[in-house]
Amino acid sequence: FKVATLYSLYVCPEGQNVTLTCRVFGPVDKGHDVTFYKTWYRSSRGEVQTCSERRPIRNLTFQDLHLHHGGHQAANTSHDLAQRHGLESASDHHGNFSITMRNLTLLDSGLYCCLVVEIRHHHSEHRVHGAMELQVQTGKDAPSSCVAYPSSSQESENITAA
């Protein structure tokens, strides 16, 4: 399987909510002993490999934000911990895997990485990540709502999390 980032850049005004999304596509094994570990973390654009450095999102580590579920299941973080920090990660039946961040501040700007791992009965088999940039802006130059710029050279889209 592969991980695609629907948008490579999100530009949002301060105070807005945003949902960053990765999509898992390609052949996905849905055997009874296959599960998926999915998580989010912040990183920096390394010279060698993007997403190799791990930093917390609003003080929550990749382990705090992870989901672990069967290949055919949907899941989301119901942890009070994440919600207290204005965060929620979720995964649906269609391969979409997202993190929603509420009440954005300038400190939320940076590179975000999603990680998807296929686990076959206790063994980590396949690890793939995706990366995207979040820019939080303030002042007169800030957009009125979040604008997402596709990974390919398509038109930008206005997107705002509910």
Epitope: T35, Y37, T39, F62, Q63, H66, H68, L115, V117, I119, H122, H123, S124, R127
Partner: antibody, heavy 121, light 106 residues
């Protein structure tokens, strides 16, 4: 926080059976494998087998088939291991451990305190 | 069954020394886990996937290796490191542990 609380020490007669319990708290018990591990002095750690509480699926180390039987009660978040036809070779500390998937790597993430089983005539 | 052989069985070191213990597998593995067991206590997860420290593990610990050869190194041993260290594979049933390396502090 995740905790595994095991039942107390047992002194058993040869030929008897013993049932050890492992009560889990702090996580979704049904979704993660419970592992059972044997430790005899000077023998290190030996994997006995595992049970997935939600489905009741089990996997055994061939060496312990017929010796150990795993069950789980999701209503009480408790896993059990029964050891039958006890001999002195079964005298050991038995641990339950819960699978944790950390950074996408499963391992024995949480351990009970151990249950000492002594088999003596 | 994959056999994990640890050496040395006993390692004696003075505080501040660098020590390395090894774990050899009878078949090639993608990665190795390590656990620490102090006397009278349950094992604790210590190093996952060959080289990643579990939460709370001091940075003086490190892990490395690939294929059939893996090692755990402590850059400067401290008294609290006195314990037995076990390697473990979760690649094939039966899942196995090494025989352990007991670290003694002089």
């Amino acid at each position: 926080q995740v905790q595994l609380q095991q039942s107390g020490a047992e002194l058993m007669k040869p030929g008897a059976s013993v049932k050890i319990s492992c009560k889990a708290t702090g996580y979704t018990f049904s979704r993660y494998w419970i592992e059972w591990v044997k430790q005899r002095p000077g023998h290190g750690l030996e994997w006995i087998g595992e049970i997935l509480p939600g489905s009741g699926s089990t996997n055994y180390n061939e060496k312990f088939k017929g010796k150990a039987t795993f069950t789980a009660d999701t209503s009480s978040n408790t896993a059990y291991m029964q050891l039958s036809s006890l001999t002195s070779e079964d005298s050991a500390v038995y641990y339950c451990a819960s699978e944790e998937v950390y950074d996408g790597y499963p391992w024995f993430g949480y351990w009970g305190q151990g249950t000492l089983v002594t088999v003596s005539a | 069954q994959i056999v994990l052989s640890q050496s040395p069985a006993i390692l004696s070191a003075s505080p501040g020394e660098k020590v390395t213990m090894t774990c050899r597998a009878s078949s090639s593995l993608s990665y190795m886990h390590w656990y620490q067991q102090r006397p009278g206590s349950s094992p604790k997860p210590w190093i996952y996937a060959t080289s990643n420290l579990a939460s709370g593990v001091p940075a003086r610990f490190s892990g490395s290796g690939s294929g059939t050869s893996y090692s755990l190194t402590i850059s400067r041993v401290e008294a609290e490191d006195a314990a037995t260290y076990y390697c473990q594979q979760w690649s094939s049933n039966p899942y196995t542990f090494g025989g352990g390396t007991k670290l003694e502090i002089k």
